[in-house]
């Protein structure tokens, strides 16, 4: 946030940039949290725009029995590994085809024991406040589907009739990692010393990090004709004086007519 300064007073302004603002020759360049000619004002909203998508990664192990293990499968650049990867990916795409959050699989290691496949199942969802529930549900469906396929697609008389066959007992879910996004925590951190006064409110499922000085939200402070200003002790209303009235009170809702006061003074003289 920048405020430009012209004229003789500029040099003075340069040395007076507040709150970590820096002079660029024309104006105070203010850090994220501040604005104003001298960076003296605290912003009333902070952009904590969530990521467009949130990802999850499930570490799984399955045992493929329809392929005999060879040493070449350990080498990720070998013809054998590349072919196995292609077939395994195609098979898993079929298994997980009904899961909208499914992105794909990534083989991390192949080892002996028929072919033990250590791999990640990758999930992704559009950010909404319910993303955790969405991804938790998706991981449960992944578990159900892989358990089902590794129970059904098995070798019979040492031959496989499916694209791939599995060992029913070789299926394990090792770990589930979900990208963490906590708008409340981000809001608190970015508001720094004003963190106690900034809150997250949602509009169209998008989080907004705002102080009560930001209008239009449920926490917004109504200063009537005054101006809301944030200080270390919280939001305060700075009341204005018009040609006809003085305003006071916590929300500048008490107006005193100047003529009455002046009239009272005249009465005393």
């Amino acid at each position: 946030r920048t405020t430009t300064c012209f004229g003789d007073g500029c040099q003075n302004t340069a040395s007076r940039c507040k709150n970590g603002g820096t002079w660029d020759g024309l104006k105070c360049q203010c850090p994220n949290l501040y604005y104003g000619e001298l960076c003296e004002e605290v912003v009333s909203s902070i952009d904590i725009g969530p990521p467009e998508t949130i990802s999850a990664q499930m570490e799984l192990t399955v045992t493929v029995t329809s392929v005999k293990f060879t040493e070449e499968l350990k080498n990720h650049s070998s013809q054998e590994f590349q072919e196995f990867k292609q077939t395994f990916t195609e098979q898993m795409n079929i298994v997980y085809s009904g899961i909208p959050e499914y992105v794909g699989v990534n083989i991390t290691k192949l080892r002996l024991g028929s072919v033990v496949v250590e791999h990640d199942v990758l999930l992704r969802t559009k950010y909404t406040p319910e993303y955790k529930t969405v991804l938790d549900n998706a991981t449960e469906v992944v578990k159900e589907k892989i358990t089902k396929v590794t129970t059904q697609q098995i070798m019979i008389n040492d031959i496989c009739s499916d694209m791939m066959c599995f060992n029913t007992t070789g299926t394990q879910v090792q770990n589930i990692t979900v990208t963490q996004y906590d708008p409340e925590e981000d809001c608190r951190k970015m508001a720094k010393e004003y963190g106690d006064y900034f809150v997250v409110e949602y509009r169209d499922q998008k989080p907004y990090c705002i102080s009560p000085c930001e209008p239009g939200f449920s926490v917004s402070k109504n200063c009537n004709l005054g101006k809301c200003q944030m200080s270390l002790s919280g939001p305060q209303c700075l009341c204005v004086t018009t040609e006809t009235h003085w305003y006071s009170g916590e929300t500048c809702n008490q107006g005193t007519q100047k003529s009455l006061v002046y009239g009272h003074h005249h009465h005393h003289h």
Epitope: T65, S66, V67, K68, T70, E72, S78, Q79, E80, E83, F84, Q86, T87, E90, M155, D158, I159, C160, S161, D162, M163, M164, C165
Partner: nanobody
Amino acid sequence: EVQLVESGGGVVQPGGSLRLSCAASGYTSNRYSMAWFRQAPGKEREVVAFIWTDGGRTYYADSVKGRFTISRDNSKNTLYLQMNSLRAEDTAVYYCAASSLLLQTINPRAWPYWGQGTMVTVSS
């Protein structure tokens, strides 16, 4: 890239014999799987037989056991299918398939490399 070229198809009378060949190229290893599949008009593609080039495994469909023999000549990178006692129901396009893996599956979707096919007609 693996390439497969079949030959040896033709018209034969019931009870007769034919020998199909499949020349393979493009392998980086001498251990892989090769198979013969067939597809009769209006039917799904089905396995006839498969073999591992290291000699570790052969498989035959029940319908051809005792009549067909799969073999390979590793020095020539060629796969064969010797078909004896042919029947009308053996009429189909015969395809050679291959995989760089040692496969134990008869599902055609698991086999990535295919020849163009050769027609076998058994008719009197």
